[in-house]
Amino acid sequence: GSMAHSDGIFKKEQAMCLEKIQRANELMGFNDSSPGCPGMWDNITCWKPAHVGEMVLVSCPELFRIFNPDQDMGVVSRNCTEDGWSEPFPHYFDACGFDEYESET
């Protein structure tokens, strides 16, 4: 199915994400004890480190091109709060489009 096809994409994107996070941490002077939100791979897409009060925007991840190849890709945000990252807004399916009646290929 398309989820299985996505596994390879995920592994590649995850590796790239961890590299990006490392570079961003160095640029921003982030370490484990820094206030704010560490960069993370949420198993769907990559989120750069952020300071408390900062909103981070990302384009819809590659996974949704598999679900909806013809759809314009949307944007998802997370807020960095004192308690860590908020959940995505909107949630991925609403932001990025998902046809639940599309048959698996």
């Epitope: 198993n43 949630h91 609403d94």
Partner: antibody, heavy 120, light 107 residues
Framework: QVQLVESGGGVVQPGRSLRLSCAAS????????MHWVRQAPGKGLEWVAV????????YYAESVKGRFTISRDNSKNTLYLQMNSLRAEDTALFYC?????????????WGQGTLVTVSS | EIVLTQSPATLSLSPGERATLSCRAS??????LHWYQQKPGQAPRLLIK???QSLSGIPARFSGSGSGTDFTLTISSLEPEDFAVYYC?????????FGPGTKVDIK
Amino acid sequence: QVQLVESGGGVVQPGRSLRLSCAASGFTFSRFAMHWVRQAPGKGLEWVAVISYDGGNKYYAESVKGRFTISRDNSKNTLYLQMNSLRAEDTALFYCARGYDVLTGYPDYWGQGTLVTVSS
Amino acid sequence: EIVLTQSPATLSLSPGERATLSCRASRAVFGNLHWYQQKPGQAPRLLIKYASQSLSGIPARFSGSGSGTDFTLTISSLEPEDFAVYYCHQSSMLPFTFGPGTKVDIK
């Protein structure tokens, strides 16, 4: 149409274990997050746990953390809730619900629930 | 965790009247606020997502508004089938939470 059918509820003594199941049909189960939400008799809704589409992300309410485990078998279109060290305050109708997302989402379709009674 | 407070706890109204239900969050929920209706003996039903987005199959008399920490569900003209309990739910910060509910009953 989306259908969620919970099972596994019953009467259990405090300290014992129970496993709930939720059989899903009418949608591509392996693409959706899934939630458990409970409702004590005559009370409001309490969110319990969520699992991402592939089981890679699991999150719990503080009241059940360390006692309950959410899991899924995408080959069987089934969601599970393993409940250990049950307490009287766990007595509730347990609903499984589809999360409209791959990671967490908000519950959009709900089952009819299975009743768990913890009593000696 | 984010605590959701709903008011009033009970709203006694007549069919045809307007119902205004409030949900207040202890911290900002960044738009991830949703409304559910529950009738006795039934599972909850999603009414409104993301504070104000309507859903197909839900009557137009149901509408939502608000942002940040203060949200409102409005039923423009109550129908007999609208007498039920209404819950708000935040999916912004884990652990997710529900409000305690507002019961709309017949005056």
